[in-house]
Interface confidence: medium
């Protein structure tokens, strides 16, 4: 009277049937402390990069300035989530925060996803306008250019995230003590179109969210290394330190930008290929095991970058300082407005004030005097 | 071969206690959750209790709490049913099942419950004075 | 508790009809819902899970629809070996609870 049991799919998939899948172990408080961690560092440092933009004059203000802005306002209004999910996951996957605040705090991931890399690649192209183009685009890189090109940007990150919004629901599914923060396909799917739903959605976040941007950012990344080369070799040898140093910069951010979202996109790819390629079981949960770290490295990036793209130049070090130093009310005039003269705009790549080379604004206009000496992030 | 034997069952009083057991094979018996489900003579069936993998959560019908306890050791591939209290209307073939249940790439924590797809051939529990 | 109810409790048809069972839940279990089949003597069988999913190995005349609170169970095509007692099981909430079963027999 026995019954041998047919081996069924577990959920997404119709391949690995003969799998046998176990709850995921949370790592206790590791991912947690990860989170929380990113959460203090993401709101200090993206407060400070906000502070530092918007406590300039709007004439000292240069096009990726917004881009700057944009990117801490992303990363921050994504980080202030990251107490919610700390507690989800040290909860072991328990949700007590309510519907509206799942649908809210996983939209923010996604409109941070691809906020973040919208903006990267906003200024990378705007960079790459000011060193391989100048003359050409100086029009193109106008205030009101990179105002719109930000608000573009915006409407996109926001559109695209919305599917997470709809979808995110909360729920005890076969679980009557905890309930979860999870994406309910029932409403535009059924059960046997659930995973086509996932996989569109997965490769078209992956298309849209990292590999066309990633593309575009290597793309300028790689005329502005053969353009600085270039002009590199018309320079006299004491320009080669300053040259490694630029170029180490951009190397940096765009194998941070890569290491980070990488392993997310890489193995949510790989385990979405597995229903074609059909991976041995320990293949398969080994990615499974391994995409909540993945994720954990993703969100890393949201207080990597003021890091990344503010801290490495010294006047936003001196608007730091300043502020640093006005909040224990030892800040005199005169330092005040010499640091804060310098560190007007800490995206804009000039130690000088608009001389003889500038256009409107203080744009550079002679491709000759690309400021490659200057030991600023984002050249102008 | 993917196999379930129960085995326990037997004639018991009013009152009294009997333990039942499911020895599994052909499968990784830690991985799976595991359920007992009844069948009174002529009547349908009835879901009793389960197990999780670690035997961290357990659930049972309200009818047997407190009466019942399942439990499992995985040193031995086996699943229990300590049945104490019973009662004539506990009357019944008692087979366990193996739960299968589905989990989400993406949202870790969720499950999808699958149904249960191993059965046992049942073990007879018989309550009479 | 969340009550199932099957209908019929129990049908008569011929081999090579089509054959619909329901199964109505007392409140919304969205598609939590599979159907098993149990010869006499023996263990049940699982034959769908998730309302609609099918179960490897199950004949593709066994079909089963619905979702919310009212499920279907179809046998398009009976066979011989079909002939047997169907049960609906919600894994909504728990307690899970079971329909009260519905007898297929030969006409």
């Known amino acids: 009277m026995e019954e041998g049991g047919d081996f069924d799919n577990y959920y997404g998939a119709d391949n690995q049937s003969e799998c046998e899948y176990t709850d995921w172990k949370s790592s206790g408080a590791l991912i947690p402390a990860i989170y929380m961690l990113v959460f203090l560092l993401g709101t200090t440092g993206n407060g400070l990069v906000l502070w530092t933009v918007f406590r300039s004059s709007r004439e000292k203000r240069r096009s990726a300035d917004i881009f700057i802005a944009s990117l801490a306002v992303a990363d921050l209004t994504f980080v202030v989530t990251l107490p919610l999910w700390a507690t989800y996951t040290y909860r072991d996957y328990d949700w007590p925060f309510g519907t509206f605040f799942c649908k809210l705090s996983s939209y923010l991931i996604f409109v941070n996803m691809y906020a973040s890399v919208f903006c990267l690649t906003g200024l990378s192209f705007d960079r790459y306008l000011a060193i391989v183009r100048p003359v050409a685009n100086a029009r193109l890189r106008l205030r009101v250019s990179g105002a719109v090109a930000t608000a573009v940007l915006w409407v996109l990150a926001a559109l695209l995230a919305m599917p997470v919004m709809v979808l995110r629901t909360t729920g005890d599914l076969e679980n009557t003590t905890k309930v979860q923060c999870y994406m309910d396909y029932s409403m535009v799917a059924t059960v046997s179109s659930e995973w086509a739903w996932e996989v569109g959605l997965g490769v078209s976040s992956t298309t849209v969210g990292f590999v066309v941007p990633f593309t575009i950012m290597l793309t300028c990344y790689f005329f502005i290394a053969q353009t600085i080369a270039g002009h590199f070799r018309k320079e006299r040898i004491e320009g080669l330190r300053k040259r490694r140093r630029l170029l180490s910069i951009i190397v940096v951010l765009v194998v941070t930008f890569a290491l980070c979202w990488m392993p997310y996109h890489l193995v949510k790819t790989l385990y979405m290929l597995g229903s074609l390629l059909h991976w041995p079981c320990d293949f398969d949960l080994f990615l499974m095991n391994i995409f909540p770290y993945c994720t954990c490295i993703s969100y890393v990036n949201s207080c990597l970058n003021p890091f990344l793209y503010a801290f490495f130049d010294p006047r936003f070090r001196q608007a730091c300082t300043s502020m640093l130093c006005c909040g224990q009310s030892r800040c005199a005039g005169t330092s005040h407005s010499s640091s804060g003269e310098k560190s007007a705009s800490y995206s804009s790549g000039h130690s000088q004030g608009p001389g003889p080379n500038m256009g409107k604004g203080g744009e550079q206009m002679h491709e000759k005097s690309i400021p490659y000496s200057q030991e600023t992030l984002v050249v102008d | 071969e993917v196999q379930l034997v129960e085995s326990g069952g037997g004639l018991v009083q009013p009152g009294g206690s009997l333990r039942l057991s499911c020895v599994a094979s052909?499968?990784?018996?830690?991985?799976?959750?595991m359920s007992w489900v009844r069948q009174a003579p002529g009547k349908g069936l009835e879901w009793v209790a389960n197990?999780?993998?670690?035997?961290?959560?357990?659930y049972y019908v309200d009818s047997v709490k407190g009466r019942f306890t399942i439990s499992r050791g995985d040193a031995k591939n086996s699943l229990y049913l300590q049945m104490k209290s019973l009662r004539a209307e506990d009357t019944a073939v008692y087979f366990c099942?193996?739960?299968?249940?589905?989990?989400?790439?993406?949202?870790?924590?969720?499950?999808?419950?699958?149904?249960?797809?191993?059965w046992g051939q049942g073990t007879t529990v018989t309550v009479s004075s | 508790d969340i009550q199932m109810t099957q209908s019929p409790s129990s049908l008569s048809a011929s081999v090579g009809d089509r054959v619909t069972i329901t199964c109505r839940a007392s409140?919304?279990?969205?598609?939590?819902l599979g159907w098993y089949q149990q010869r006499p003597g023996k263990a049940p069988k699982r034959l769908i899970y998730a309302a609609s999913s099918l179960q490897t190995g199950v004949p593709s005349r066994f079909s089963g629809s619905g979702s919310g609170t009212e499920f279907t169970l179809t046998i398009s095509g009976l066979q011989p070996e079909d002939f047997a007692t169907y049960y609906c099981l919600q894994h909504n909430s728990y307690p899970r609870t079971f329909g009260q079963g519905t007898k297929v027999e030969i006409r």
């Open positions: 099942a193996r739960d299968r249940f589905g989990y989400s790439f993406y949202d870790k924590g969720v499950r999808y419950y699958y149904g249960m797809d191993v």
């Open positions: 197990i999780k993998q670690d035997g961290s959560e357990r």
């Open positions: 052909g499968f990784t018996f830690n991985n799976y959750w």
């Open positions: 409140q919304g279990i969205r598609n939590d």
